[in-house]
Amino acid sequence: APTSSSTKKTQLQLEHLLLDLQMILNGINNYKNPKLTRMLTFKFYMPKKATELKHLQCLEEELKPLEEVLNLAQSKNFHLRPRDLISNINVIVLELKGSETTFMCEYADETATIVEFLNRWITFCQSIISTLT
């Protein structure tokens, strides 16, 4: 059974992941990003189901495409450090989903834009956090 300290650690890691995903989304939405239109043409795979930490496998598998899109989006008005940012996110995802069990991700038939993709995983984090608190 999860201890209160492990639950707290999980909550903090989810909050970390949530904040990093929100930072990317805010950057895409709120700044004069000349490459936004092009960014929205890239398609991301969405999880068929995302209700448990093991489902983060589906996010992990899409982190490389996310890094590539963020690299393409770099401009004077949209500056992130995609390699470091995705590396930070990857570390948290690996810790959260664990490596004990191998989970095969199932994807939905419909693909999504980067905005829809980020919103989906932000909602996932918020949902899990709410069950922990």
Epitope: M23, N26, K76, R81, R83
Partner: antibody, heavy 121, light 110 residues
């Protein structure tokens, strides 16, 4: 008005770990939109970026210092900290903390007053 | 990685105009914003120009920044020089991996 203040020991022995804290007042580290940075200036020399942290805890470092640098954040105290391991005399410098925008580009404003750290036995 | 090269020192008389250059060694100067910081002796740096040509509130309009893609350099121009402008000036830019400062230029107001 946002203010930053560095604090920590002014003298560190070679091979030990340098530890500094930056206390932010007049604004919240958790408000988002900014990274929290460390920069240093060797005596009589130019400026060198060390790294920065987002309030989520995500770190970004100068590639040349990455292996020795740890930056952490304590949102409850409105502070962020720098640890630099295995220091040598070459790490003697004035260390500054500063605020950096997250998406519109890496620049620094405002800066703390700076604290001189000397590495000597 | 790229470097930013500035003249070691410049000097000019009060009331005159001075320009400090900052040349990027590789990659386009226009690809990322350039900032300029003023550092008076014994003080921490303060921003005089950010995002190529923007002035923070409180910085007089005697200070201006520009970018020249043909020479791959940025410039800080100070007009109507005053003795209080005597300081070290640093340019700064970045890429997706690093933040880079110029070596600094000592401005002497004669």
């Amino acid at each position: 008005q946002l203010q930053l203040q560095e604090s920590g020991p002014g003298l560190v022995k070679p091979s030990q770990t340098l530890s500094l804290t930056c206390t932010v007042s007049g604004g919240s580290i958790s408000s988002g939109g900014y990274y929290w940075s460390w920069i240093r200036q060797h005596p009589g020399k130019g400026l060198e970026w060390i790294g920065y942290i987002y309030y989520s805890g995500s770190n970004y470092w100068n590639p040349s210092l990455k292996s020795r640098v740890t930056i952490s954040v304590d949102t409850s105290k409105n502070q962020f900290s720098l640890k630099l391991s295995s220091v040598t005399a070459a790490d003697t410098a004035v260390y500054y903390c500063a605020r950096t925008p997250t998406v519109t580009g890496d620049w620094f404003d405002p800066w703390g007053r700076g604290t001189l750290v000397t590495v000597s036995s | 990685n790229f470097m930013l090269t500035q003249p070691h020192s410049v000097s000019e008389s009060p009331g005159k105009t001075v320009t400090i250059s900052c040349t990027r060694s590789s990659g386009s100067i226009a690809s990322n914003y350039v900032q300029w910081y003023q550092q008076r002796p014994g003080s921490s740096p303060t921003t005089v120009i950010y995002e190529d040509n923007q002035r923070p509130s409180g910085v007089p309009d005697r200070f201006s920044g520009s970018i020249d893609s043909s020479s791959n350099s940025a410039s800080l121009t100070i007009s109507g020089l005053k003795t209080e402008d005597e300081a070290d000036y640093y340019c700064q830019s970045y890429d997706t991996r690093d933040v880079v400062f110029g070596g600094g230029t000592k401005l002497t107001v004669l």
